[in-house]
């Protein structure tokens, strides 16, 4: 009983993981990411850093049941959403600051998954079917990538001293968290 | 291994308020999360709300935003669920949970009862 009342929170189930992190789908109505609400951006900032440690992107943490269809995970988890935009970290005091957002002079910085764990978990299926388990792939961390605009802002460019590895042998898999999905647990994340 | 023990339950009338405390022994991490889940008579356990060990960032179920507040106080290694207007749908007994990121909860209290009279 009860398992009507459950939500598909659209986690993505994986069949095999790959070795390298990649990143996630754009948000739709990414409001931080619009330029002109927000007067576009200032010719210089003082707190202008060209330092990767000076650098850091703002971390929502949320928590969750994983879902397939009726069935649900016996434990929870708690994942990352990696939201919009980065600056200097002596100006994200709390990594969750409100009010307005430091903009680069210089290219466009985004904040994406950095890290994933991959997690086993056990799903509970109603009407007496047998628990399976499944592999998960949760957001562990969060990171600055530079976003060139020669590549019509499609290529990102780690902020890291690593460049970020081609895929080999990776398959093209579905992405099941919609950008709708995503964008529903950003905003509860507030 | 984390131990929980929460405190803090009882009965309330419909609109009033609870403050629950979740104490934590043994390790903790800069990257954990403490949650706060709850079970109704007859339901399967639910998420309330999370809160993040180092940077105080936290989330809550949309059926309590508003209405409860999660804080922590790194000092006591405590965690603490503030619920106010209290309704009898949150009636059930609540459970902390300790996670680091990116995982499952595998670190549960025994949990505490909130029972809301209307």
């Known amino acids: 009983q009860g398992w009507q009342a459950f939500k598909n929170d659209a986690t993505e189930i994986i069949p095999e993981l790959g070795e390298y992190p990649e990143p996630p789908p754009e948000l739709e109505n990414n409001k931080t990411m619009n330029r002109a609400e927000n007067g576009g951006r200032p010719p210089h900032h003082p707190f202008e850093t060209k330092d990767v440690s000076e650098y850091s992107c703002r971390e929502l943490h949320f928590t969750r049941y994983v879902t397939d269809g009726p069935c649900r995970s016996a434990k929870p988890v708690t994942e990352l959403v990696c939201s919009g935009q980065c600056g200097p970290a002596r100006l994200l005091p709390n990594a969750i600051g409100r009010g307005k957002w430091w903009r680069p002079s210089g290219p466009d910085f985004r904040c994406i998954p950095d890290r994933y764990r991959a997690q086993r978990v056990q799903l509970l299926c109603p009407g007496g079917e047998a628990p399976r388990a499944r592999k998960v792939r949760l957001v562990a961390s969060c990171k600055c990538k530079r976003l060139t605009r020669f590549h019509n802002q499609s290529e990102l460019k780690d902020f890291g001293t690593e460049a970020a590895r081609p895929q080999k042998g990776r398959k093209p898999r579905p992405r099941a968290r919609s950008a709708k999905a995503n964008q529903a647990e950003l905003e509860n994340a507030y | 291994e984390v131990q929980l023990v929460e405190s803090g339950g009882g009965l309330v009338q419909a609109g009033g308020s609870l403050r629950l405390s979740c104490a934590a022994s043994?390790?903790?991490?800069?990257?954990?999360?403490m949650g706060w889940f709850r079970q109704a008579p007859g339901k399967v356990r639910e998420v309330v709300g999370s809160?993040?060990?180092?940077?105080?960032?936290?989330y809550y179920a949309d059926s309590v935003k508003g209405r409860f507040t999660i804080s922590r106080d790194n000092a006591k290694n405590t965690m603490y669920l503030q619920m106010n207007s209290l309704k009898p749908e949150d009636t059930g007994v609540y459970y902390c949970?300790?996670?680091?990121?990116?995982?499952?909860?595998?670190?549960w209290g025994q949990g505490t009862q909130v029972t809301v009279s209307s």
């Open positions: 949970a300790v996670a680091e990121l990116g995982s499952t909860y595998n670190d």
């Open positions: 043994g390790r903790t991490f800069s990257r954990d999360v």
């Open positions: 809160i993040t060990w180092s940077g105080g960032s936290t």
